[in-house]
Interface confidence: low
């Protein structure tokens, strides 16, 4: 069937349109185009005779039409009047006629629109504003944008006049925005420049800052007033109803009790004609006395005595506050406050309760602090410590031992050897010792104020032979690239040299290896798997030497990035797929597989028999080391070709 297609259907003025003919019959004599929906000689545009290839213009020909041998008609430089129907009249060689009708619509290219407004300075909650999109254009659609967004749904927004007019009822300050209108027709769209709506509002109720209403005599009063307003508000201050000044800030230096009263800020907006006021009541106080602390026990004994601290002077209707170590009181069952908070009781004091303690008196305005008080808590003695820590000595050297025990007041010391009292000093000195000086050395510490005593016993061995050393470690299973390990050679002996060997060799030079504590401690920073070796320490003096048994470091590492073998990525259908995954790790990792993201078995080897092209995809091996808490994975693409075809490379191969 003969049909006409208009390309395009909607045509812009000045552009062109092609009336394209489909299913044109064979064996034609000629054809003719007419304006309208029927054949009318008065409205003929152009005729065409195939035999002569001659085109003949008709009464409706405008000089803008071109007819093609395939009967299609091109109309150029389209005008509004071209809108409508077009009829093609086809005359076949057997003089049988056939007709078809097509149509198109013509629209103007739209000009850039602009926005007109009926009110350039509307007042909040009072005025309405009507925006109109100019010019008025036939067959055009009007759209509106607020801050480059489509119109929000609001009962205060109304479109009228075919959406050409946007009315905002009862404008608010939030309507201050960028407004644009847009005109559209089927062939063009244009957007206006933005119009900013300037809404007059306020003043809102002013706020007076700062908020505090209580001041001390002698301070400066500096009040500031602010009210949201457009245009900005004008401010006035009144004190007890009397006008003071027309400024936003009110400053009164060196105030007295007489400056107490009501302070009013008035905000005025000259454009809206509105006034708003806020009142604050200011109270000025005279200075209170400085507090001080008294105590019922100046030298309490640890774990025995209680102490009551009292804040003086006693003032009626006053709030008392306490601080310990410059912090508010901690929650503790050993701390108790009296009903009026004036007395703080410490039950069963400890050495940590020394303070300092402060109390404060709070008036309506501020807090006055006392001077700090420190408690002299009597404690100790604790278990004494004997230094140095050596237990082995060579004959002929001097033995010098020192004793210390935490105590208040400081402890008095006594030394005993094998239970026999030696001297009442903090230090014990014996020159040129022999094997006979081996024995039990006891330090006794005594606190004369509390009457308590404590002792510590140390075994001293005097011998020419050094004992066999041993290695202690602070970390038996360090994690690679994370942990450090400190080996210590035991025991600690006087005038002794400490040596280290790794795998039977002396220590390599490395910034990760550090000797300390007189070479007695060997620290390995940021251990690696290569540090998993045998470590031996040795001790020697001028007459003997000895070595420890080896200690092997067990370094946890990995898992490293796994390797999937074999490396092939292309397989023939029917083959067996046998993928093995390996990752360096200590301890051995756990393995799992995923095919195309779907979890499979938790094994090191993935086996699929007689694969088909359905087995194409990504094969991922995941490894995890529970000891190091680390994971790793690798992905491999597998392509399976049907038997008999040459397997190509897969994507990602």
């Amino acid at each position: 069937k003969l049909t006409i297609e208009s390309t395009p259907f909607n045509v812009a003025e000045g552009k062109e349109v092609l009336l394209l003919v489909h299913n044109l019959p064979q064996h034609l004599f000629g054809y003719s185009w007419y304006k309208g929906e029927r054949v009318d000689g008065n409205r003929q545009i152009i005729g065409y005779v195939i035999g002569t290839q001659q085109a003949t213009p008709g009464p409706a020909y405008s000089g803008r039409e071109i007819i093609y041998p395939n009967a299609s008609l091109l109309i150029q430089n389209i005008i509004q009047n071209d809108t409508g129907f077009y009829t093609l009249h086809v005359i076949k060689s057997d003089l049988v006629n056939e007709e078809a009708t097509g149509q198109f619509r013509v629209y103007p290219e739209l000009p850039k629109p602009s926005i007109s407004s009926n009110n350039s300075k509307p007042v909040e909650d009072k005025d309405a504003v009507a925006f109109t999109c100019e010019p008025e254009t036939q067959d055009a659609t009007y759209l509106w944008w607020v801050n480059n967004q489509s119109l929000p749904v609001s009962p205060r927004l109304q479109l009228s006049n075919g959406n050409r007019t946007l009315t905002l009822f009862n404008v608010t300050r939030n309507d201050t925005a960028s407004y644009k209108c847009e005109t559209q027709n089927p062939v063009s769209a244009r957007r206006s420049d933005s119009v900013i709506l300037n809404v007059l509002y306020g003043p809102d109720a002013p706020t007076i800052s700062p908020l505090n209403t209580s001041y001390r005599s002698g301070e400066n009063l500096n009040l500031s007033c602010h009210a949201a307003s457009n245009p900005p508000a004008q401010y006035s201050w009144f004190v007890n109803g009397t006008f003071q000044q027309s400024t936003q800030e009110l400053f009164i230096p060196n105030i007295t009790v007489n400056n107490s009263g009501s302070y009013t800020c008035q905000a005025h907006n000259s454009d809206t004609g509105l006034n708003r006021t806020t009142v604050t009541t200011i109270t000025v106080y005279a200075e209170p006395p400085k507090p001080f602390i008294t105590s019922n026990n100046s030298n309490p004994v640890e774990d025995e005595d209680a102490v009551a601290l009292t804040c003086e002077p006693e003032i009626q209707n006053t709030t008392y506050l306490w601080w310990v170590n410059n912090q508010s009181l901690p929650v503790s069952p050993r701390l108790q406050l009296s009903n009026d908070n004036r007395t703080l009781t410490l039950l069963s004091v400890t050495r940590n309760d020394v303070g300092p303690y402060e109390c404060g008196i709070q008036n309506e305005l501020s807090v006055d602090h006392s001077d700090p008080v420190i408690l002299n808590v009597l404690y100790g003695p604790d278990d004494p410590t004997i230094s140095p820590s050596y237990t082995y000595y060579r004959p002929g050297v001097n033995l010098s031992l020192s004793c210390h025990a935490a105590s208040n007041p400081p402890a008095q010391y006594s030394w005993l050897i094998d239970g026999n009292i030696q001297q009442h000093t903090q230090e014990l000195f014996i020159s040129n010792i022999t094997e006979k000086n081996s024995g039990l050395y006891t330090c006794q510490a005594n606190n004369s104020a509390s009457g308590h005593s404590r002792t510590t016993v140390k075994t001293i061995t005097v011998s020419a032979e050094l004992p066999k050393p041993s290695i202690s470690s602070n970390n038996s299973k360090p994690v690679e690239d994370k942990d450090a390990v400190a080996f210590t050679c035991e025991p600690e002996a006087q005038n002794t040299t400490y040596l280290w060997w790794v795998n039977g060799q002396s220590l390599p030079v490395s910034p990760r290896l550090q000797l300390s504590n007189g070479n007695r401690t060997l620290t390995l920073f940021n251990v690696t798997r290569n540090d998993a070796r045998a470590y031996v320490c040795g001790i020697q003096n001028s007459v003997s030497a000895n070595r420890s048994d080896p200690v092997t470091l067990d370094v946890l590492y990995g898992p490293d990035t796994p390797i999937i073998s074999p490396p092939d990525s292309s397989y023939l259908s029917g083959a067996n797929l046998n993928l093995s995954c390996h990752s360096a790790s200590n301890p051995s990792p756990q393995y799992s597989w995923r095919i195309n993201g779907i979890p499979q078995q938790h094994t090191q080897v993935l086996f699929i028999a007689k694969i088909t092209p359905n087995n194409n995809g990504t094969y991922a091996c995941f490894v995890s080391n529970l000891a190091t808490g680390r994971n790793n994975s690798i992905v491999k693409s597998i392509t399976v070709s049907a038997s008999g075809t040459s397997p190509g490379l897969s994507a990602g191969a």
Epitope: T618, K636, A653
Partner: nanobody, 119 residues
Framework: EVQLVESGGGLVQPGGSLRLSCAAS????????IGWVRRAPGKEEELVAN????????RYADSVKGRFTISADTSKNTAYLQMNSLRAEDTAVYYC????????????WGQGTTVTVSS
């Protein structure tokens, strides 16, 4: 914070070349797949190319095959789109995006760089 910053767009004549860069921060591009998405007025959004640096997988839309090449430098954490034999229909805003390896769905993209092909 995950960020993708595109650069390299501009005006070029038909048949010319451009190289777009996508600098990633806040994540490692070898842990995911990166794609280039283009948007042109009146046309459907199109994923023109994507790459999964971890295993070297690449994919191209039919409209750019043989003309565009996607690559990645994991040491610089940057993806590239080399565009040769540019045509007028390649005019668009090009966005760098994080792309799902499985279904090529993209859920995060940068601010875009404009490519205009015109004589």
């Amino acid at each position: 914070e995950v960020q993708l910053v595109e650069s390299g767009g501009g005006l070029v004549q038909p048949g010319g070349s451009l190289r777009l860069s996508c600098a990633a921060s806040g994540f490692n591009i070898k842990d995911t797949c990166i794609g280039w998405v283009r948007r042109a007025p009146g046309k459907e959004e199109e994923l023109v190319a994507n790459i999964c640096p971890y295993h070297g997988y690449t994919r191209y839309a039919d409209s750019v095959k043989g003309r565009f090449t996607i690559s990645a430098d994991t040491s610089k954490n940057t993806a590239y789109l080399q565009m040769n034999s540019l045509r007028a229909e390649d005019t668009a805003v090009y966005y760098c995006a994080i792309v799902s390896y499985v279904d090529e769905y993209y859920n995060y993209w940068g601010q875009g760089t404009t490519v205009t092909v015109s004589s």
